[in-house]
Interface confidence: medium
């Protein structure tokens, strides 16, 4: 992407000056002068530079992700865009730069216990006897192997609760689903009066933990029906 080209550290990630990727004939996109990319940065024009066409994040370099260059643009045209730095908005982990991950729609720093700064290949150890660490292409898209076995931690993108670590459930947050903590005793919970009504929630809560159920808080019995507060209580 344009800013990875401008970044002196990313010279090894330079896409070909002309032509697209194998398997994407004719899908190269010309960079318009001063085009504004979703990352929110304006770039200079680079002679002969063509953004790299892609279908998936894994086809881009470590400091890139695959997306349509314009918000709401032609979904059929996707190129490798610069990864988003800390505190920028995101929709998935691959959008965030190495060393960061997407939590609650924002790129945040990965601590040692979270993601290990990798794209797919989390082989940060050395191979053979050369003690070389992974090159720049091997740093961003998956959880580290430790994460595979411990499952998704809080804030990890998920599809179902079984993707999340113990004590977490998979719940909606904005446009995606992330691992959130299962509710503890006394915490506010959501009691769905109509089956399927949880589908309307933008910020979905987890269910109550083992031995707890979502019930009206005792001192709220007198409150009007609509404002009743539910909390997780012992059976």
């Amino acid at each position: 992407t344009l800013n990875s080209v401008l970044n002196s550290n990313a010279i090894k990630n330079l896409p070909p000056p002309l032509g697209g990727a194998a398997g994407h004939p004719g899908s190269a996109v010309s960079a318009a002068p001063g085009i504004l990319y979703p990352g929110g940065n304006k770039y200079q024009t680079i002679d002969n530079y063509q953004p790299y066409p892609c279908a998936e994040d894994e086809e881009c370099g470590t400091d890139e992700y695959c997306a349509s260059p314009t918000r709401g643009g032609d979904a059929g045209v996707q190129i490798c865009l610069a990864c988003r730095k800390r505190r920028k908005r995101c929709m998935r982990h691959a959008m965030c730069c190495p060393g960061n991950y997407c939590k609650n729609g924002i790129c945040v720093s990965s601590d040692q216990n979270h993601f290990r700064g990798e794209i797919e290949e989390t082989i940060t150890e050395s191979f053979g006897n050369d003690h070389s660490t992974l090159d720049g292409y091997s740093r961003r898209t998956t959880l580290s192997s430790k994460m595979y076995h411990t499952k998704g931690q809080e804030g990890s993108v998920c599809l179902r609760s079984s993707d999340c670590a113990s004590g977490l459930c998979c719940a909606r947050h904005f446009w995606s689903k992330i691992c959130k903590p299962v509710l503890k005793e006394g915490q506010v919970c959501t009691k769905h009066r109509r089956k399927g009504s949880h589908g309307l929630e933008i910020f979905q809560r987890c269910y109550c933990g083992e031995g707890l159920s979502c019930r009206i808080q005792k001192d709220h019995h007198q409150a009007s029906n609509s404002s009743r507060l539910h909390t997780c209580q012992r059976h």
Partner: antibody, heavy 121, light 116 residues
Framework: EVQLLESGGGLVQPGGSLRLSCAAS????????MGWVRQAPGKGLEWVSG????????VYADSVKGRFTISRDNSKNTLYLQMNSLRAEDTAVYYC??????????????WGQGTLVTVSS | DIQMTQSPSSLSASVGDRVTITCTSS????????????LAWYQQKPGKAPKLLIY???KVASGVPSRFSGSGSGTDFTLTISSLQPEDFATYYC????????????FGQGTKVEIK
């Protein structure tokens, strides 16, 4: 058209060395993970080694670790496999393969025709 | 290390048959971060190089007929040929990558599809 052409196979004695080459064309070589897969006569496929785009990171099957070295020359669009301390069980057709991805090694979408390596005294 | 087990190891079928091959991995292939199961299927004919049929569990590779499809998640995966054609008689391999720090690539032992 994507093409991968292996060379360097042949007959070698146990303990000997051989260097396989794979000349790539028809795609942007420097952007993709590349790998070597072998197939012993009458047997199934066995992955040997993989190398990521800039060449700085490599992975090996346990059976060849410490004996084989994978490398690439992006300026020449060529992939290499240096095989040392060869054993009879290394006898196989060796395929060079291109991965579909730049960052994930496993989906090999283009393969060479293979080169036969025979280790025998 | 991860192991990939295919079944059956061989099968006999007729042209037009629906054929299903299964592949079971010794550990989950689901990748929480990329939201994918990294599993591929290859076809190999005698004396020829393997050909990628399916990747990411269900995506059909370029130039592969639509009668080939893949499904599954976690540890259990399936390759289906909806209506077997004469050119489909071959050996099929599933493949994935180890979830250990090394991300080694592993192949199943293969399933030979023969003419009944």
């Amino acid at each position: 058209e994507v093409q991968l052409l292996e060379s360097g196979g042949g007959l070698v004695q146990p303990g000997g060395s051989l260097r396989l080459s794979c000349a790539a064309s028809g795609f942007t070589f420097r952007r993709y993970v590349m790998g070597w897969v072998r197939q012993a006569p009458g047997k199934g496929l066995e992955w040997v080694s993989g190398i990521y785009p800039s060449g700085g990171s490599t992975v090996y099957a346990d059976s060849v670790k410490g004996r084989f070295t994978i490398s690439r020359d992006n300026s020449k669009n060529t992939l290499y496999l240096q095989m040392n301390s060869l054993r009879a069980e290394d006898t196989a057709v060796y395929y060079c393969a291109k991965d579909r991805y730049s960052q994930v090694h496993y989906a090999l979408d283009y393969w060479g025709q293979g080169t036969l390596v025979t280790v025998s005294s | 290390d991860i192991q990939m087990t295919q079944s059956p190891s061989s099968l006999s079928a007729s042209v037009g048959d629906r054929v299903t091959i299964t592949c079971t991995s010794s550990q989950s292939l689901f990748n929480v971060r990329s939201q994918k199961n990294y599993l591929a299927w290859y076809q190999q004919k005698p004396g020829k190089a393997p050909k990628l049929l399916i990747y990411d569990t269900s995506k059909v590779a370029s130039g592969v007929p639509s009668r080939f499809s893949g499904s599954g998640s976690g540890t259990d995966f399936t390759l289906t040929i909806s209506s077997l054609q004469p050119e489909d008689f071959a050996t099929y391999y599933c493949s994935s990558r180890d979830n250990s720090d090394n991300h080694l690539v592993v192949f199943g032992q293969g399933t030979k599809v023969e003419i009944k």
